[in-house]
Amino acid sequence: MNSFNYTTPDYGHYDDKDTLDLNTPVDKTSNTLRVPDILALVIFAVVFLVGVLGNALVVWVTAFEAKRTINAIWFLNLAVADFLSCLALPILFTSIVQHHHWPFGGAACSILPSLILLNMYASILLLATISADRFLLVFKPIWCQNFRGAGLAWIACAVAWGLALLLTIPSFLYRVVREEYFPPKVLCGVDYSHDKRRERAVAIVRLVLGFLWPLLTLTICYTFILLRTWSRRATRSTKTLKVVVAVVASFFIFWLPYQVTGIMMSFLEPSSPTFLLLNKLDSLCVSFAYINCCINPIIYVVAGQGFQGRLRKSLPSLLRNVLTEESVVRESKSFTRSTVDTMAQKTQAV
């Protein structure tokens, strides 16, 4: 998280020759995993299974449509971000099982835990892009008819990914491995040591750019969109709208604990009881944030079932129905039926 993973150590898993005697007391240690760590492990396991399979399926469904369907491009990129993050889970899982011992080396320490932050920034920037797209579809349909195309969507995604990488760099740079003398253990974490101000700056930037600002802008954006759609008769675009609102809401719900504890820890003294308590919850907060990596496919399936009445179709076709919308070609321009429907409404309203 924002500071070194100050977790209660244990040395029951070391070789006998490595230890004094398994009954030797060591400052504030425990031979068992704490409850928050056990909960984190359960969440990690579920997220990994659902996230890898679910996002792989979403990637498979949307990849074929991404050349021509803009919604498919958005959902494909979201799924790739989630899928990448899920790949780090087995290693994070192993580390927690070993009482936060990190045997994977410095490079892995810098890269793998940074994936969840990359996912956070990529997801929120992609969600902001999707939301801007929904906003434009409702309020600027003529502009969309002229300019909204797959090429522009891919450029927007590339910008989102680039910015996400840029915002992940500070945490990546400060990640280090530390080998503790006793109990013998290697820890992976962020160490700002002398630079408490920089730690706070990183935490504040993460909170503002990765949480508060998107929360504010997306809330405003969807308030306008929902007001507009509720004031018109239902159109097919509400399907995607409901899915996107659900995805956005889940993003903020599951990132909240991580962001709150992160900002608190950056302002607390590392030896304070509150800091140590929050640090014990670190893995649980990370695992809770990781739910974002598997929740989207679940939302798509639930939404698909809602639209189908009941699950009559196969899973891929159900997902295809939610994530892609048939393209209607008019004047050599490719746009989704939701665009056309919304535009028709706009014309009627004027």
Partner: antibody, heavy 125, light 112 residues
Framework: QVQLQQSGAELAKPGASVKLSCKAS????????MHWVKQRPGQGLEWIGY????????KYNQKFKDRATLTADKSSSTAYMQLSSLTYEDSAVYYC??????????????????WGQGTTLTVSS | DVVMTQTPLSLPVSLGDHASISCRSS???????????LHWYLQKPGQSPKLLIY???NRFSGVPDRFSGSGSGTDFTLKISRVEAEDLGVYFC?????????FGSGTKLELK
């Protein structure tokens, strides 16, 4: 009372090896870890490594890993440090230091409570 | 490796004076269990070092209460409230949180 008696001064040639000893008395030898520390004339202290006499487990400072070998003889309550491929930079006073596994409110082998008197090693051709 | 920086390198005092020695580490010394494993040793001329303070602020047996330690994370201080003749020598701070264990370069407490 606790005593750590170290062997006398050593004179060695560059490239040679020496074996320094540290005889413990006044406590149970296997219940304490033994560390070795180097001090060059007028300079600070440098940690070499430790041995757990009970199990024979050793841990070294990477800087000394290839040239220092720590051993312990439980029967004579003596810890040894062998230094090989000596260079002029190895000229220093070498201390053995005992580490308690618990003391007061502290549990774990974290500090040196007793030190030997030191062995002076001079590397000269 | 953790670099331990002691200041000042030399501290001239008069008997009965207060003395303060600072020790700063290049990395945080907070162990994963919340403890700071920072200790202070005194080495008198021609002798081996002796433990004064362990774990930042705990006096070792036989150490007078005029010695006190404080600090956390990367900044630590040893204070001597009224310097006596037997306190003169070189003071070393040492950390045993991370491998390799490291020592400060020493602060020589001497008479003015």
């Amino acid at each position: 009372q606790v005593q750590l008696q170290q062997s006398g001064a050593e004179l060695a040639k560059p490239g040679a090896s020496v074996k320094l000893s540290c005889k413990a008395s006044g406590y149970t030898f296997t219940s304490y870890w033994m560390h070795w520390v180097k001090q060059r004339p007028g300079q600070g202290l440098e940690w070499i490594g430790y041995i757990n006499p009970s199990s024979g487990y050793t841990k070294y400072n990477q800087k000394f890993k290839d040239r220092a070998t720590l051993t312990a003889d439980k029967s004579s309550s003596t810890a040894y440090m062998q230094l090989s491929s000596l260079t002029y930079e190895d000229s220093a006073v070498y201390y053995c230091a005992r580490v308690p596994l618990s003391y007061g409110s502290s549990y774990g082998p974290y500090f040196f409570d007793y030190w030997g008197q030191g062995t002076t090693l001079t590397v000269s051709s | 490796d953790v670099v331990m920086t002691q200041t000042p390198l030399s501290l001239p005092v008069s008997l009965g004076d207060h003395a303060s020695i600072s020790c700063r580490s290049s990395q945080s010394l907070i162990h994963s269990n919340g403890n700071n494993y920072l200790h202070w040793y005194l080495q008198k001329p021609g002798q081996s070092p002796k433990l004064l303070i362990y774990k930042v602020s705990n006096r070792f047996s036989g150490v007078p209460d005029r010695f006190s330690g404080s600090g956390s994370g990367t900044d630590f201080t040893l204070k001597i409230s009224r310097v006596e003749a037997e306190d003169l020598g070189v003071y070393f701070c040492s950390q045993s949180t991370l491998v390799p264990l490291t020592f400060g370069s020493g602060t020589k407490l001497e008479l003015k």
